[in-house]
Amino acid sequence: ECGHISVSAPIVHLGDPITASCIIKQNCSHLDPEPQILWRLGAELQPGGRQQRLSDGTQESIITLPHLNHTQAFLSCALNWGNSLQILDQVELRAGYPPAIPHNLSCLMNLTTSSLICQWEPGPETHLPTSFTLKSFKSRGNCQTQGDSILDCVPKDGQSHCSIPRKHLLLYQNMGIWVQAENALGTSMSPQLCLDPMDVVKLEPPMLRTMDPSPEAAPPQAGCLQLSWEPWQPGLHINQKCELRHKPQRGEASWALVGPLPLEALQYELCGLLPATAYTLQIRCIRWPLPGHWSDWSPSLELRTTERAPTHHHHHHHH
């Protein structure tokens, strides 16, 4: 190797200056005694190199790039060799930003996978490899005192969420949780959450069903629907409140919300609807009165209201 580049820093803030030096060894005898060292950033020649012969006979060129505005580029030093450019050495330069503070950190406890899933927003692009780590600890109190640390959770590349498995969780005890972002230019940490995994539990919704007509039960009135639901068994012992939403299948009507309904209602007569109309219905539930997250809406149930009784039957319906 005839030449060697060294740089003040291979990674800098975008727009910052960078200084580089290229030294050509004296024993490169095939070179001119006074070779002119040229600089190139990417494909562009860069003027402004200051060249000098050092006491040991080596040649040095120093260049300062006033603003590195490329997020990634190769800086090379070269010599004219005949009528071509002979590259002596090159280095990769990176420029970007330190990580912003990750924000909107939130978590939910999934009882099916037995894990606490936390997600966050990483902030603006840094243009540099940036690692995110979900850090946590167990705490007896309100997270002012740190208990056992929990193994760091490292998301897969490009993901802004991570799952803490059950073996690292303690239900009904607080955990301190935060995200640390790190790259070559710095480290930042999100505000810390303090939570009991059960207080962020997200249940699965019940399954809506049509109520089987029983011989002794009166049929639904016009504009009414009779429905029932089967609770999600693994969450059966958790007190919940639920809500229904419904809308006519045809037309542009928005969802109408009905609730709160206790999970234990298990069956319900919904009235005040249009007669002889097909409706789409969904249900969702949340741990209550203790804290929790709403479940997703259940798969839709499609039901049709009965027709209004003919007028000559003299039946009066009270809604």
Partner: antibody, heavy 118, light 107 residues
């Protein structure tokens, strides 16, 4: 301190009836599922029945379905088990217990012995 | 219905021994597995809930692990007061079921 105190056990003839009670204190009774678990002499634990916080959901073990009825009175903080058509194989210590949110039993009462024998 | 198979049904051990009891579910039950200790003439006492959570007041020598179908209760260093019968209990859906029990006796 959470306490559960069973009563109502005793000797009864096959085909007879008995009503067990469980008085609860030290927690908000109306917010929790409750349950009955029994243990025949020298045998393991067997779940009998549970009841939801407001009494609307009442699953039973197949071995007692149609014969036993679980109920609760939230105003009296009391759980009941009405046992009809009793059989010799129903002989056991009956425990009442509070259910946790993910279905575990804690704490348990001290138990009451039911003996079905002629 | 889900069956819970507990093994061994009994074991002899000495004070200070590490003891492991296993419980196998006939199908996957996520982490809905609890462990109880029962001493003669007494009501059962909850040790571990949701597979690995130590109940308040239970010594840290007790630990639970596993998920899906295979679960383990470990006593890291057996103490004189630990000689008792241990039961696993499945609580994900009805009917709730218990394992057959493991009696831990003095060698």
């Amino acid at each position: 301190e959470v306490q559960l105190l069973e009563s109502g056990g005793g000797l009864v003839q096959p085909g007879g009836s008995l009503r067990l009670s469980c008085a609860a204190s030290g927690f908000t009774f109306s917010l929790y599922w409750m349950g009955w678990v029994r243990q025949a002499p020298g045998k393991g634990l067997e779940w009998v029945s549970s009841i939801s916080s407001s009494g609307g959901v009442t699953p039973y073990a197949d071995s007692v379905k149609g014969r036993f009825t679980i109920s609760r009175d939230n105003s009296k903080n009391t759980l009941y088990l009405q046992m009809n058509s009793l059989r010799a194989e129903d002989t056991a210590v009956y425990y009442c217990a509070k259910l946790g949110e993910l279905g575990w039993f804690d704490p348990w009462g001290q138990g009451t012995l039911v003996t079905v024998s002629s | 219905d889900i069956q819970m198979t507990q093994s061994p049904s009994s074991l002899s051990a000495s004070v200070g021994d590490r003891v492991t009891i296993t419980c196998r579910a006939s199908q996957g039950i996520s982490s809905y597995l609890n462990w109880y200790q029962q001493k003669p003439g007494k009501a059962p006492k909850l040790l571990i809930y949701y597979a690995s959570n130590l109940q308040n007041g239970v010594p840290s020598r007790f630990s639970g692990s596993g998920s899906g179908t295979d679960f383990t209760l470990t006593i890291s260093s057996l103490q004189p007061e630990d000689f008792a019968t241990y039961y696993c209990h499945f609580s994900m859906q009805y009917p709730l079921t218990f394992g057959g029990g493991t009696k831990v006796e003095i060698k």
